[in-house]
Amino acid sequence: MRTEAQVPALQPPEPGLEGAMGHRTLVLPWVLLTLCVTAGTPEVWVQVRMEATELSSFTIRCGFLGSGSISLVTVSWGGPNGAGGTTLAVLHPERGIRQWAPARQARWETQSSISLILEGSGASSPCANTTFCCKFASFPEGSWEACGSLPPSSDPGLSAPPTPAPILRADLAGILGVSGVLLFGCVYLLHLLRRHKHRPAPRLQPSRTSPQAPRARAWAPSQASQAALHVPYATINTSCRPATLDTAHPHGGPSWWASLPTHAAHRPQGPAAWASTPIPARGSFVSVENGLYAQAGERPPHTGPGLTLFPDPRGPRAMEGPLGVR
């Protein structure tokens, strides 16, 4: 099994290595090389479960397995979001969670997975063969979506086999953007390597050493724009209580959510639909999502300067979640 090192930031090369090559020129080829060699595909999984206690109640779970930073999650039913599907919930890392009937409770379970409970009764309740889709917007991968549904003959309390990596749709902006950068980077890398074939290589200082030669995936962590949050105090004090849907979110409000394209046929719920979100602000930049910030009158968060190399525990797919290493 491959194990890999985590590099919190690019260290300056050792004094003897600078020579005619500048510091920047030294660093760039290795960053690009990492990107070219290891650019992998993230994975989204979706699991739909009918609750044994409430026969018409569903729990949808979704997870993102990639090295990028999640900036938005959209859960929809009746097909992919934006392609005839109706939005059930939108989860933002900092600004909170918005949900629409029949969604009862949406929440983050970890920093890379979410769950959504659906009410079972009423005209808008789902039937057993309804398709549920989860779309994760992340940087640098772009947007990735997968769908799942309960088999018609499912027994209560059983879950449908989770969809294994069937990424139904990846937004072109994300794919083309990243692919373009990688392609350009690879070409430029080859050019640089030709020019500096006989120069010594810089040494990256990993924060956690690896017994094997690392083949890691590069991810440039971005920092969410704190200025846009208008936090009045640095200290936040919260009683340790379970999540409730009537909790007002401390940083963000209806003005931001009002601009979200929900494709929903029904009106958003009232205050009870609000819930604070547990996921942290882990760099919230995705090219396809910039419109959201613009509509909300905010600058898209800027990309931070650091570089983190993340281990890749299972073959070519990098599973590590971003750690905002300085």
Epitope: W45, E109, T110, A165, S239, P250, P278, P280, E320, G321
Partner: antibody
């Protein structure tokens, strides 16, 4: 590298409160959830809850909902946990732990709380 | 809440032999090909140390003699060959849903 430095041991009387700290360094404090875990002497580990330092949101194990208060100071990159109405059952080592994606790779050294009359 | 049941509670293994620790969840904690179960080692007076994440992925810097397997509800930590320094208590943890829970622990002694 990532480091979580916890405050020193606390000796408290029954009914009192204690507030322990976990100072984070080596990463961007607001980027990851900070979890708290309890371990009674000679016993196993119990997950208490976490705080999201970026917006102050907390989630807790139901068992600790009236016992623990989690907070965070972004300016000093420090997470806090206050335990109130202490009883002998609260005597334990309390760890802070940093989450990445879906696991907890980084842990503080622990703070020992002893409740004694 | 999901309950994780670890077995055995204690284990005495000869140096160089294989140690096998089991962790059973009260409901599935897997999706796709990933299981939200992680293994930790704890030595007296120290915090837990992550060994394995996602049931089978070795954490960076952890010796290759540690390995994890399993999916759904049944998970296993293997240590082979066991070394003196492996004397510790081992815990499984799930992060499938809140609240997260730990297994009761398995104390490994080297004979």
């Amino acid at each position: 590298q990532v480091q979580l430095q916890q405050s020193g041991a606390e000796l408290a009387k029954p009914g009192a409160s204690v507030k322990m700290s976990c100072k984070a360094s080596g990463y961007t404090f607001t980027s990851n959830w900070m979890h708290w875990v309890k371990q009674r002497p000679g016993q196993g580990l119990e997950w208490i809850g976490y705080i999201n330092p970026s917006n102050g949101y907390t989630e807790c194990n139901q068992k600790f909902r009236d016992k623990a208060t989690l907070s965070a100071d972004k300016s000093s990159s420090t997470a806090y946990m206050q335990l109130n109405s202490l009883t002998s059952a609260d005597s334990a080592v309390y760890y802070c732990a940093l989450m990445i994606s879906a696991w907890l790779p980084y842990w503080g050294q622990g703070t020992l709380v002893t409740v004694s009359a | 809440d999901i309950v994780l049941t670890q077995s055995p509670a204690s284990l005495a293994i000869s140096l160089g032999q294989r140690a096998t620790i089991s962790c059973r969840a009260s409901q599935s904690v897997s999706a796709s090909s990933y299981s939200y179960v992680h293994w930790y080692q704890q030595k007296p007076g120290q915090p837990p140390k992550l060994l394995i994440k996602y049931a089978s992925s070795l954490e960076s810097g952890v010796p290759a003699r540690f390995s994890g397997s399993g999916s759904g509800t049944d998970f296993t930590l293997n240590i082979h060959p066991v070394e003196e320094e492996d004397t510790a208590t081992y815990y499984c943890l799930h992060t499938w849903e809140i609240p997260y829970t730990f297994g009761g622990g398995t104390k490994l002694e080297i004979k």
